[in-house]
Structures are given as structure tokens and as C-alpha cells.
């Protein structure tokens, strides 16, 4: 058993049929010595008396808010949560496996630039009685500070018969140099509590590996005389690290119709303009990627050909 | 500790081309190592990230773009002084700071070159003959060093009398390649910045 936060405790249980469970001793936070009784949740049934209460925690029915009273007055609470371990593996029931970039990916993180700011998100099908707490650091043995905000519900989607909820959090490394060469990864830890179930999820990464620039901005077309060709130009996104001559991007320019199966024109360039063949009912799209360290491509910025 | 804006014209900057080749060569070599050594811990997640140049050179700080010198977090206290006469520079326009940056890059390359050559000598003794260093990568390191043209003491190649542990050598190769790729990215950024300034 360990303390998650004040008056909230996590009981780690090996979860299998007829498991013996864990013996837990609760102590009432009071100078009083006698006349103390214990109850669980909203029940008025007295579970025991005395300053301490010893319980055998085996299942979720044994978890919850234990309260010690004296003469009708509440003295203190202890909330017990369960963390299940099945076949030596901690449960991951609360969050959905996003399976990208690999299986067992519950947290996904992205950074728009090298400033040390990044966003992580996760998915769940649970809509109520759900809380998250996020901590982060650079390295784990001698951790350096990373400050994370509160996790918020950022999107809701319907997937077949299920609703899916996306939560996200923004974090900022306290003293980040955009030009630094990372040798210690960022660690992100998410505590998830659903009703009386506790789970924790972690992700470890270098900012350089989670870079995904914003799409290029200000796409403009200029038809070329006596030709099917069009000159398309764009600018670096505002959120990209500066100076751009140091933090350079490379671009992919594509002309394609509405369907992915349609024919297309595609060219890669390090410049902020390119010449492509425009077709009726097609769109010109441009996306960006760090020129020197191939992490993710940005989303496409698009303009119609016409 | 930063790069001034007054830097050479693009035409006078042959190092950019060499640094691009360097990044390409080390990336290819790392990819080859990951594939060949698939049953060794050779991915970014599996290895310890070590920097053999730590406390010996200060390339990131010495080559910091002017725009980032206002960022307190970028101003590390490490200082190293180097010989200052590089041929990638249009000499009259060169500042002391830029020479410091380029000589720091030169020292990095020299250190990695020695490590890689020592390692290759060990790998050549491996009866499995599983992996060797790409000669193209070693050649590209050499070309960039020549383009930088700094005179410095030659570092003797480390020779070891004991039997090499090939497993450890291959893991060390992965560690070195990962670190060198990150440094090659920095070098490429620096050359691009100098070329554009």
C-alpha cells in the first residue's frame, strides 16, 4: 500500500481467483484514543472500533472511503483504491491502446517545435467518475523539472456504438534550450482513477522524436504563362523554432483529387516554393518535416487548384 | 559563445555539402546497424545515450545561433578554446567565435574518427564478420575534416591488448552511432545557418 495523495491510498493486488489479497491497517488521524468507530462509503454499518482498523483487501467491494467517527462526528477519511496486477502485468483497463506507433501505446505526445513544450493525449471509453493526474520530468534518476497543466477533455468521438473521449495535457520543460542535444529522455507519468480502480501509464521520449511541425502557412498559387504548371509558395508555420536557417524544414508538395486513389503530382523541396501541374477539381497540398531529423510530417495545408 | 551574423557568402562555404553527406552517411550506417544487429539493444529506446565529446568540446554552445543567445538555458558554462584557422571560412569575414565553433566541430569529428577506426579494427577480428563500419562514412568524416582544415594534434588510435568482447563492441557501436547522428544533425544545422547568414 502507498499514498497517492493526502488520505488516498493505493493497494496493489495480485488479481487471480481466490487470491489472498492484502492486509491493510488503517489509522484514524486523531488524538482521540477510544470511542472510535469505522464505516465504509455511505453505509452506516460499523466495521470495527478503535484507533486502527485491520482489513483484508481482496476485491473492489473492499475498497472505497473508510471513515472513522466519534459520537457522530467525522474524524478522518482514508480512500482505498485498487491497482490490479494480472499475471505479473498491471491492468490497463481505463485507457485505450492507440496501437500507434506500436502496440501498448496508451499515451501519445507531440511537440510543434524544440522549445520544450509538448502535448500528450490519451483515449478512453469511460465518461464518468474519472480523474487524471500528470507528472513529468527530464530523466528519472536525477530528474529535471517539467511542468504540466491539468488534463482536460479535448475531444469526443463516436466509434461505432461506443463514444470515445480524448483527454490531453500540455507540459513545458522548465529550462529548455531549443538547440540542445538531448541525452536524457522526457518521462511522462499519468495516474488514472476510475471509481475505485487506479492505474498508471508512462511514456518516455526525446523531444526530437515527437516533433510534428504545424502545417505551412499562407499557401499561394501563381499560374505560369503558356504552361499547365503553377508556382505554389508558402511560409514556415509561426510555431516553428527560429532561426529558420538553423531549424530548417523540408516540404512535400502534392496535387491530388478528392480520392487518394487518383493520380497525383508530387515533389519534395527544401525551398518555400515549387512548380507543379494543377488539374481541375484537384487541390495543392503542402506539408513540412524537420530537414535534418526525420520525425513526423505536419498535417497538410491545402488550396484548391482552380 | 555564439555565431555572429557576419558570416561567409554561400559560395564560400564548402562545408555545407560535406555536412549533408555526413548526416546522410551516419544515418545510413545507423539504419544498417539497427537491421544487422536486430537482436542487440540498438534502438534509441534501448541504448544509453552517451556523448564521447562531453566536457571535451562544446559544439552546441560554441555554435549557438545569435538568436538563441538570449535564451538563458542555452548558455552553458562550458568553455573550450581551440586553434582558429579554418578554410571553410572566408577568412577576412571570419570572427573568432565562428572559428571557435568550426574548430569545435573539427575536434568532434576527430574524436569520433578515432573511436570508429578503433572499433572497426575490433569488428574486423570478429569471426562472425557481422558488421563493419561503412568506409563511405569514414571517408565523409575525413572530407569534412579536410574542408574544415584545422591543424591539431593527431590523436593516436587506441589499441587494446586484451581479447575484444564482440557483443560489447557492437553495443558500443550502436551507442556511438546514435550519438554521432545527433551531433551530425547539429553540425548540419550550424552549416545551414552559417551558409544562410
Amino acid at each position: 500500500i502507498w499514498e497517492l495523495k493526502k488520505d488516498v491510498y493505493v493497494v496493489e493486488l495480485d488479481w487471480y481467483p481466490d487470491a489472498p489479497g492484502e492486509m491493510v491497517v488503517l489509522t484514524c488521524d486523531t488524538p482521540e484514543e477510544d470511542g472510535i468507530t469505522w464505516t465504509l462509503d455511505q453505509s452506516s454499518e460499523v466495521l470495527g472500533s478503535g484507533k486502527t482498523l485491520t482489513i483484508q483487501v481482496k476485491e473492489f467491494g473492499d475498497a472505497g472511503q473508510y471513515t472513522c467517527h466519534k459520537g457522530g462526528e467525522v474524524l478522518s477519511h482514508s480512500l482505498l483504491l485498487l491497482h490490479k496486477k494480472e499475471d505479473g502485468i498491471w491492468s490497463t483497463d481505463i485507457l485505450k491502446d492507440q496501437k500507434e506507433p506500436k502496440n501498448k501505446t496508451f499515451l501519445r505526445c507531440e511537440a510543434k517545435n524544440y522549445s520544450g513544450r509538448f502535448t500528450c493525449w490519451w483515449l478512453t471509453t469511460i465518461s464518468t467518475d474519472l480523474t487524471f493526474s500528470v507528472k513529468s520530468s527530464r530523466g528519472s534518476s536525477d530528474p529535471q523539472g517539467v511542468t504540466c497543466g491539468a488534463a482536460t477533455l479535448s475531444a469526443e468521438r463516436v466509434r461505432g456504438d461506443n463514444k470515445e473521449y480524448e483527454y490531453s495535457v500540455e507540459c513545458q520543460e522548465d529550462s529548455a534550450c531549443p538547440a540542445a542535444e538531448e541525452s536524457l529522455p522526457i518521462e511522462v507519468m499519468v495516474d488514472a482513477v476510475h471509481k475505485l480502480k487506479y492505474e498508471n501509464y508512462t511514456s518516455s521520449f526525446f523531444i526530437r522524436d515527437i516533433i510534428k511541425p504545424d502545417p505551412p502557412k499562407n499557401l499561394q498559387l501563381k499560374p505560369l504563362k503558356n504552361s499547365r504548371q503553377v508556382e505554389v509558395s508558402w511560409e514556415y508555420p509561426d510555431t516553428w523554432s527560429t532561426p529558420h536557417s538553423y531549424f530548417s524544414l523540408t516540404f512535400c508538395v502534392q496535387v491530388q483529387g478528392k480520392s487518394k486513389r487518383e493520380k497525383k503530382d508530387r515533389v519534395f523541396t527544401d525551398k518555400t516554393s515549387a512548380t507543379v501541374i494543377c488539374r481541375k477539381n484537384a487541390s495543392i497540398s503542402v506539408r513540412a518535416q524537420d530537414r535534418y531529423y526525420s520525425s513526423s510530417w505536419s498535417e497538410w495545408a491545402s488550396v484548391p487548384c482552380s | 559563445r555564439n555565431l555572429p551574423v557576419a558570416t561567409p557568402d554561400p559560395g564560400m562555404f564548402p562545408c555545407l555539402h560535406h555536412s549533408q553527406n555526413l548526416l546522410r552517411a551516419v544515418s545510413n550506417m545507423l539504419q544498417k546497424a539497427r537491421q544487422t544487429l536486430e537482436f542487440y539493444p540498438c534502438t534509441s529506446e534501448e541504448i544509453d545515450h552517451e556523448d564521447i565529446t562531453k566536457d571535451k568540446t562544446s559544439t552546441v554552445e560554441a555554435c549557438l545561433p545569435l538568436e538563441l543567445t538570449k535564451n538563458e538555458s542555452c548558455l552553458n558554462s562550458r568553455e573550450t578554446s581551440f586553434i582558429t584557422n579554418g578554410s571553410c571560412l572566408a577568412s577576412r569575414k571570419t570572427s573568432f567565435m565562428m572559428a571557435l565553433c568550426l574548430s569545435s566541430i573539427y575536434e568532434d569529428l576527430k574524436m569520433y574518427q578515432v573511436e570508429f577506426k578503433t572499433m572497426n579494427a575490433k569488428l574486423l577480428m570478429d569471426p562472425k564478420r557481422q558488421i563493419f563500419l561503412d568506409q563511405n562514412m569514414l571517408a565523409v568524416i575525413d572530407e569534412l575534416m579536410q574542408a574544415l582544415n584545422f591543424n591539431s594534434e593527431t590523436v593516436p588510435q587506441k589499441s587494446s591488448l586484451e581479447e575484444p568482447d564482440f557483443y560489447k563492441t557492437k553495443i558500443k557501436l550502436c551507442i556511438l552511432l546514435h550519438a554521432f547522428r545527433i551531433r551530425a544533425v547539429t553540425i548540419d544545422r550550424v552549416m545551414s545557418y552559417l551558409n544562410a547568414s
Epitope: 493520380k263 508530387r266 515533389v267 512548380t275 501541374i277 488539374r279 | -
Partner: antibody, heavy 118, light 107 residues
Framework: QVQLVQSGAEVKKPGSSVKVSCKAS????????LHWVRQAPGQGLEWMGW????????EYAPKFQGRVTITADESTSTAYMELSSLRSEDTAVYYC???????????WGQGTLVTVSS | DIVMTQSPLSLPVTPGEPASISCRAS??????LHWYQQKPGQAPRLLIY???QSISGVPSRFSGSGSGTDFTLTISSLQPEDFATYLC?????????FGQGTKVEIK
């Protein structure tokens, strides 16, 4: 299986024209760009131009501009390349090639040898 | 026009050994470079597109690398059927242009 089948070899006199055909099978004809590329004996490849069979749009290499015409007939899934004012240096194998991507070629015809000789 | 220069023009290789062919562009073409194999009397066959992207059905011993002006096609271990001419092609701008070809011959 996508295939491009070209017309047979031709012998032409200098100053005349030649029209080579390229019939496509497998896949929808208008879903692909179609190019013509030639190869003189013992020489490299030389791109001549492309057509979008969907709308008849064409683009020609400046070297052949005014002398080459690429057309397409959707009803027969056939593309044509006509080269006029032939000279001896036009002796080459002429290939048609196609792709959904405009700028490179994933399927090629077998080639048509055009010999220009007086 | 962008001029593509291949080297060497002829490359004698022992079967089973690796081979590397170089292609250089007269100006930077990013990764807009494609590789083809051509055997005598046959049409070219696409091997690699956009410098390093592999084609399904092409053996994994063929790989490509490079960007900007310098590109390499590598055959990790030459098989008897690999003795042919290899051509690079740029697609950075029209007109599309090809290298003059590298003939890989049996040593």
C-alpha cells in the same frame, strides 16, 4: 495485371513523320499519366512528354516542342506519339510508360524501334 | 535542364559482392530521384522511388539513399540476374532527365 503494348517497328525517311501507338490494359486508362521516353542506340533515356488522358492535357520537353504531339483515345485506351520532321538522330527505341504519379514511371511498354534512314 | 551524372559508367563486380552506384545532380533536387534497372532489349524497370522508397516485388537487396545532389543505389549482394544497366532519373523539374546509365558487369 497492367500492361502497355506498343505498335511494331517502323522505318522512316528523313523529313517524314511517325506515329507510334501504345495500348493499355488493366486498370482504368484515364487514372494514369502516360509518358513517352526514347532511347537512341547505346545511349541513355530521353523524356519527351506526357499526357493526361482524362482531359488531354500535355506537357512536352522543350527539345521536342513543336515537333511532337501526344494524343490519347479513351475509348480504345490507346495513346499515340507523333514525331514530325524526322532526322537520322531520331533513330531510337520509343517507349510509352505510365504511372499514377506524374514524374516517374512504374509500368513501361516493350518499346518500338523507329529507324530514320534515307 | 538538370543534368544527371552517373559514376562509374561501368562497374565490374563479383557475384555475391555488394555494389554501389552514384548519381549526381547539377543542382539540388531534394529527394526527387528514382532508380531503374534495364537489361539489353528490355524496357526499364522501376527499383526505387524518391531516393529511398522501395517498390513491392523488388528484392530487398536493392536500396537507395541520398538527397540534394548526391545519391547512391546499393545492391547488398549481387545475384546473377542483377547484371544490367542502372539509370537514375530526376523529377524535381521538367523536363525530366536521366543519368547516362551504369553498366554492372560480371568481374
Amino acid at each position: 495485371q497492367v500492361q502497355l503494348v506498343q505498335s511494331g517497328a517502323e522505318v522512316k525517311k528523313p523529313g517524314s513523320s511517325v506515329k507510334v501507338s501504345c495500348k493499355a490494359s488493366g486498370g482504368t486508362f484515364s487514372d494514369y499519366y502516360l509518358h513517352w521516353v526514347r532511347q537512341a542506340p547505346g545511349q541513355g533515356l530521353e523524356w519527351m512528354g506526357w499526357i493526361d488522358p482524362e482531359n488531354g492535357d500535355t506537357e512536352y520537353a522543350p527539345k521536342f516542342q513543336g515537333r511532337v504531339t501526344i494524343t490519347a483515345d479513351e475509348s480504345t485506351s490507346t495513346a499515340y506519339m507523333e514525331l514530325s520532321s524526322l532526322r537520322s538522330e531520331d533513330t531510337a527505341v520509343y517507349y510509352c510508360a505510365r504511372n499514377k504519379e506524374l514524374r516517374y514511371f512504374d509500368v513501361w511498354g516493350q518499346g518500338t524501334l523507329v529507324t530514320v534512314s534515307s | 535542364d538538370i543534368v544527371m551524372t552517373q559514376s562509374p559508367l561501368s562497374l565490374p563486380v563479383t557475384p555475391g559482392e555488394p555494389a554501389s552506384i552514384s548519381c549526381r545532380a547539377s543542382q539540388s533536387i531534394s529527394i526527387n530521384l528514382h532508380w531503374y534497372q534495364q537489361k539489353p532489349g528490355q524496357a526499364p524497370r522501376l527499383l526505387i522511388y524518391f531516393a529511398s522508397q522501395s517498390i513491392s516485388g523488388v528484392p530487398s537487396r536493392f536500396s537507395g539513399s541520398g538527397s540534394g545532389t548526391d545519391f547512391t543505389l546499393t545492391i547488398s549482394s549481387l545475384q546473377p540476374e542483377d547484371f544490367a544497366t542502372y539509370l537514375c532519373q530526376q523529377s524535381n523539374s521538367f523536363p525530366l532527365t536521366f543519368g547516362q546509365g551504369t553498366k554492372v558487369e560480371i568481374k
